[in-house]
């Protein structure tokens, strides 16, 4: 349940050098500065808990300001092997190698890690996102081309004394950022090897990692403004539920999405929003500073707890699931996109969820912790919450058992 075990060396306290080491925004991902090669080449790398490859642009591309130049690194080693990663939309492909990697605003270590040098891509890099590669922080099982390619975090833990744990605080701005503001803005923190108490309030509550591939968890109940969606809990996890910093939205299985939207529509029925809004197509706008947050419901996801028959809930506000979007045509207004969408690959707890919480990926103890983020956007009436314990029976039945076929890893 809550995080009250004795402190362990290196796992608690202050990690000042790592605080505020992320930049970006929820719509285009959060990135950390990394260096690759000798002499070091600096790149901005997307932090993605939904994949397991460390892959960087290694050839010119119209959306890249810079890229990894292997020929300039005296420590690069070619693995003489290609890698091809197709997505639902788009793909990237490249050449595998290893090189020395470090994180300037991270632990003071350098590790030799596998690197996929991206030579060709389609619909992967995002124009204006300011990142040039991706750091897949999930497990080897979903690494490409296969699970023998050791992910970066595994290499880091093996080669150093860094504890097998990292934590993320993603800070949504609550208002749209233009390009120069993004470059100057703080996006949050990735604490490698520990937990920083200054980044959250209240207690940390832990849910088991069901299986070490994605960061898979089990949702046992969903409420909209305290009203149970009353679905068979298997539906919430069909075909899986994952925590993914590389996805913008809260993505829900079709049936769950439809039930959730119906419930959110009913709760916010004082205003009539266009169908395109619920689809993520149309923006809704209000005169600057007048967004009626109170008409939108809170959303609670109950997660399996660490103790038998015990769960806890995480509650997000409309400030998390209505994503601010800047549009010159309506610049006098505050405009938002509905950031909950339909999924055919299970529930994805993306930035919309993560921006409300400090999330601890405790790989050593096969669990994920949630606490209220010190930087989450809220108003004077409501705040995001992590609360428990609740008694929930037969939670194991909520997990869906996927028929064994190769699962592709995707950032969407």
């Amino acid at each position: 349940e809550t995080d009250e075990e004795p402190e362990e060396p290196g796992r608690r306290g202050s990690f000042v050098e790592m605080v505020d080491n992320l930049r970006g925004k929820s719509g285009q991902g959060y990135y950390v500065e990394m260096t690759v090669g000798s002499p070091p080449q600096t790149l901005n790398i997307l932090v993605d808990t939904g994949s397991s490859n460390f892959a960087v642009g290694a050839a010119p591309h119209p959306f890249l300001h810079r890229y990894y130049q292997r020929q300039l690194s005296s420590t690069y080693r070619d693995l003489r092997k290609g890698v091809y990663v197709p997505y639902t939309q788009g793909k990237w492909e490249g050449e595998l190698g290893t090189d020395l990697v470090s994180i300037p605003h991270g632990p003071n270590v350098t590790v030799r890690a596998n690197i996929a040098a991206i030579t060709e891509s389609d619909k992967f890099f995002i124009n204006g996102s300011n990142w040039e590669g991706i750091l897949g922080l999930a497990y080897a099982e979903i690494a490409r081309p296969d699970d023998s390619l050791e992910p970066f975090f595994d290499s880091l833990v093996k080669q150093t004394h860094v504890p097998n744990l990292f934590s993320l605080q993603l800070c949504g701005a609550g208002f749209p950022l233009n390009q120069s503001e993004v470059l100057a803005s703080v996006g949050g923190s990735m604490i490698i090897g520990g937990i920083d108490h200054s980044l959250y309030t209240g207690s940390l509550w832990y849910t088991p990692i069901r299986r070490e591939w994605y960061y898979e968890v089990i949702i046992v109940r969903v409420e909209i403004n305290g009203q149970d969606l009353k679905m068979d809990c298997k539906e919430y996890n069909y075909d899986k539920s994952i925590v993914d910093s590389g996805t913008t939205n809260l993505r829900l299985p079709k049936k769950v999405f439809e039930a959730a939207v119906k419930s959110i529509k009913a709760a916010s029925s004082t205003e009539k929003f266009p169908d395109g809004f619920w689809l993520g197509e149309q923006l809704v706008c209000w005169q600057a500073g007048t967004t009626p947050w109170n008409i939108f419901p809170v959303i609670s996801l109950y997660l399996m707890g660490e103790v038998t028959n015990q769960s806890f809930r995480i509650t997000i506000l409309p400030q998390q699931y209505l994503r601010p979007v800047e549009d010159v045509a309506t610049s006098q207004d505050d405009c938002y996109k509905f950031a909950i969408s339909q999924s055919s690959t299970g529930t994805v707890m993306g930035a919309v969820i993560m921006e409300g919480f400090y999330v601890v990926f405790d790989r050593a103890r096969k669990r994920i912790g949630f606490a209220v983020s010190a930087c989450h956007v809220h108003d004077e009436f409501r705040t995001a919450a992590v609360e428990g314990p609740f008694v929930t029976l037969d939670m194991e039945d909520c997990g869906y058992n996927i028929p064994q076929t190769d699962e592709s890893t995707l950032m969407t």
Epitope: D327, A329, T412
Partner: antibody, heavy 116, light 107 residues
Framework: QVQLVQSGAEVKKPGASVKVSCKAS????????IHWVRQAPGQGLEWMGI????????KYNQKFKARATLTVDTSTSTVYMELSSLRSEDTAVYYC?????????WGQGTLVTVSS | DIQMTQSPSSLSASVGDRVTITCKAS??????VAWYQQKPGKSPKSLIY???HRYSGVPSRFSGSGSGTDFTLTISSLQPEDFATYFC?????????FGQGTKVEIK
Amino acid sequence: QVQLVQSGAEVKKPGASVKVSCKASGYTFTNFWIHWVRQAPGQGLEWMGIIDPSDSYTKYNQKFKARATLTVDTSTSTVYMELSSLRSEDTAVYYCARSGVAFPYWGQGTLVTVSS
Amino acid sequence: DIQMTQSPSSLSASVGDRVTITCKASQDVGRNVAWYQQKPGKSPKSLIYSASHRYSGVPSRFSGSGSGTDFTLTISSLQPEDFATYFCQQYNSYPYTFGQGTKVEIK
């Protein structure tokens, strides 16, 4: 500033297909969906369909579902509208328009003439 | 599909006149109505969204009102550059539909 630049006029024979392009600039391409609207000579505006550039999700007006195909190329920030099995009543100006609240930005239009 | 019926289909007015165009939806569309101006050979220009909000840069003489099924576009003092065709549109539900247009001509 936001700009939608469409490809040039086309003359096609009945039964043929036409592919019109719409190149977007001045905003984050994947943030906003793109609509297609057509206007027959001297007539009103008719919504054909929409595409989400971030994942190529499409939604069509039932009237065009069988013949229209919307696609996207994010590397060039371009959306395409292909209309097949052309007939004379498809002669029209075809516009792309960017989403937001309603359609704040429009392309300059592409005249497609279908004539034997 | 939702029908948008505009009236009048055309009108003649002089510079300085107050002009009102109405649009009626066949079912409740909330405030999810936009208005566009189109000049011959040109693409439509966005004027009003959410029934009454002006897009950035649109002159204040253009105003919109209404909700549910009845909507109005008003030009408080017609200017020479305002002679054009005006369309209303509902974007409440798919397929999005437009009114047939109102042509504002010089008297």
